[in-house]
Interface confidence: low
């Protein structure tokens, strides 16, 4: 039986403590002594399950001793003070530090009291997202890449987009032992409509307060898509100048515009001004098919427009821009 008056002297500690790879962590451990209880602590000891010997000892007269003096430190224990706080700080946390530790108080008259603590080693991943610049392929290709490097446990990567697309996610061991690098490719059939749009990579990890969102601006290289605007089918003799515009979307930007007709060069009443074509007043009806040919680094594309200038009053129908 224990001596008279001996109550519940217990060691208090969390069952699990998280710590970050490379950082320091404190394993908290306290001796809880009831009010009327008397206890004398002569030693504090830390040991790791599965390893022989102790990793840290605080002796009543000798002070602290460590198996790895540069990596361990008693936080509060001091010579000449009551040994009630055995909390141990570990520096430069490694993956192999993960495991079960026993914190033990050598007391009198209660004897030894101990508790087990599970140290969980986490690694906060570094996250990057980058565009994979592509051309029109007609088949699904990676258009964005999101990498969460060196997480422990592995980060969760999801993609958010109204463009559709399919993720392709893989994992490899991280450079630091026990960590994982997660790579997620966002795969879609490239189209001109996708160029310049955004997709968002969402990275979730238990080390983050909130998910990290990384936006990728997609790049699709494509030849020009061409149309001609400015004609409303209501052009009449005697009206003022009108302007047609060659509207081109492309990536990279157009490098040249060339105006012609199906019959060859432009007639005298049509004057090319880059992407615009000035149509001067004419004195007789015309029916001409105009061609705008647009070039960029990937090729050339054209659009055609048949323009008619008819007899009749340029009354309220007129769609020509007047000077």
């Amino acid at each position: 039986w224990p001596p008279p008056g001996t109550g519940d002297v217990v060691v208090q500690a969390p069952t699990q403590v998280p710590g970050f790879l490379g950082d320091s962590v404190t394993l908290p451990c306290y001796l809880q002594v009831p009010n009327m209880e008397v206890t004398h602590v002569s030693q504090l000891t830390w040991a790791r399950h599965g390893e022989s010997g102790s990793m840290a000892v605080f002796h009543q007269t000798q002070g602290p001793s460590y198996s790895e003096s540069k990596r361990l430190e008693f936080v509060a224990a001091r010579l000449g003070a009551e040994l009630r706080n055995a909390s141990l700080r570990m520096f430069g946390l490694r993956v192999e530090d993960e495991g079960n530790y026993t914190c033990l108080f050598v007391t009198f008259p209660q004897g030894s009291r101990s508790v087990d603590i599970w140290l969980r080693v986490l690694a906060k991943p570094q996250n990057t997202a980058e565009v994979q610049k592509v051309q029109l392929t007609g088949e699904p290709v990676p258009m964005a890449r999101c990498v969460s490097t060196g997480g422990r446990p592995p980060a969760q990567i999801t993609w958010h987009s109204d463009l559709g697309g399919m993720p392709n996610t893989s994992q490899v061991p991280g450079f630091l032992s026990g960590t994982v690098t997660v790579t997620s490719l966002w795969i879609l059939v490239p189209s001109s409509q996708v160029d310049g749009k955004n997709v968002t990579c969402k990275v979730e990890h238990e080390s983050f307060e909130k998910p990290q969102l990384l936006t990728v601006n997609l790049t699709v290289y494509y030849p020009p898509e061409v149309s001609i605007s400015g004609y409303d089918n209501n052009w009449y003799l005697g009206q003022n100048e009108a302007t047609l515009t060659c509207d081109a979307r492309s990536n990279p930007e157009p490098t040249g515009y060339n105006w012609s007709t199906t019959m060859g060069p432009l007639p005298p009443f049509a004057v090319a001004q880059g992407a615009q074509l000035l149509i001067r007043p004419v004195d007789k009806p015309i029916n001409t098919t105009l061609i705008c040919n647009v070039t960029n680094a990937l090729g050339a594309r054209q659009a055609e427009l048949t323009v008619q200038v008819k007899e009749g009053p340029p009354s309220e129908h007129s769609g020509i821009s007047r000077n």
């Epitope: 490379g22 570094q126 990057t128 990498v147 490097t149 893989s170 490899v172 061991p173 450079f175 630091l176 690098t181 790579t183 490719l185």
Partner: antibody
Framework: EVQLVQSGSELKKPGASVKVSCKTS????????MHWVRQPHGKGLEWIGG????????SYNQRFKGRVTITVDKSTSTAYMELSSLRSEDTAVYYC?????????WGQGTLVTVSS | DIQMTQSPSAMSASVGDRVTITCKAS??????VAWYQQKPGQPPKALIY???YRYSGVPDRFSGSGSGTDFTLTISSLQAEDLAEYFC?????????FGQGTKLEIK
């Protein structure tokens, strides 16, 4: 533009040491692991080891353990690889390479010749 | 260590030919394989990552396939500038290992 620029060729005697540098630019040095790979003339590639610039943690190929030391100088974004106790079979082109799972950028290579 | 065995060690082909290089891993490496092209006097250049995805800027005549232990690099229509040595590499586990290389010559 990512660039890895290595130091010049070295001629060493057996038993000596060599230290090769790799100065980087165009990216954040501490965000990527730097590795070293060597290639004897006309032969294949052999991974030597690597270092994480942030924490200085290293990983080495056991074949070179004890003879190789990889370090970094964060202030100049430079990685170093030192190989000691050189022997003739260490004659090779030594490359630094940035790691992204695979090696996406390589230095131009440094020829180390070991000859008496 | 994981061995990466490449074949053939050397080959000759004509412009326009379809060329296939294989790489066999001594144990499962998933899809954690990269392919590199090395031209004479130059460092290696990454072509393929994760076994089958081309790096941006790499011509689409280059393609990779495979998973587990068997991997292939294919050049669909050989060009004169493809004269080089090609290497596979596993990055599933340390130490990273490379194939011994395939020297490709143009007939």
């Amino acid at each position: 533009e990512v660039q890895l620029v290595q130091s010049g060729s070295e001629l060493k005697k057996p038993g000596a040491s060599v230290k090769v540098s790799c100065k980087t630019s165009g990216y954040t040095f501490t965000e990527y692991t730097m590795h070293w790979v060597r290639q004897p003339h006309g032969k294949g590639l052999e991974w030597i080891g690597g270092i994480h610039p942030n924490q200085g943690e290293t990983s080495y190929n056991q074949r070179f353990k004890g003879r190789v030391t990889i370090t970094v100088d964060k202030s100049t974004s430079t990685a170093y690889m030192e190989l000691s106790s050189l022997r003739s079979e260490d004659t090779a082109v030594y490359y630094c390479a940035r790691w992204t799972g695979d090696f996406d950028y390589w230095g131009q290579g440094t020829l180390v010749t070991v000859s008496s | 260590d994981i061995q990466m065995t490449q074949s053939p060690s050397a080959m000759s082909a004509s412009v326009g030919d379809r060329v296939t290089i294989t790489c066999k891993a001594s144990q499962n490496v998933g899809t954690n394989v990269a392919w590199y092209q090395q031209k004479p006097g130059q460092p290696p250049k990454a072509l393929i990552y994760s076994a089958s995805y081309r790096y941006s800027g790499v011509p689409d005549r280059f393609s990779g396939s495979g998973s587990g232990t068997d991997f292939t690099l294919t050049i669909s229509s050989l060009q004169a500038e493809d004269l080089a040595e090609y290497f596979c590499q596993q990055y599933q586990s340390y130490p990273y290992t490379f194939g011994q290389g395939t020297k490709l010559e143009i007939k």
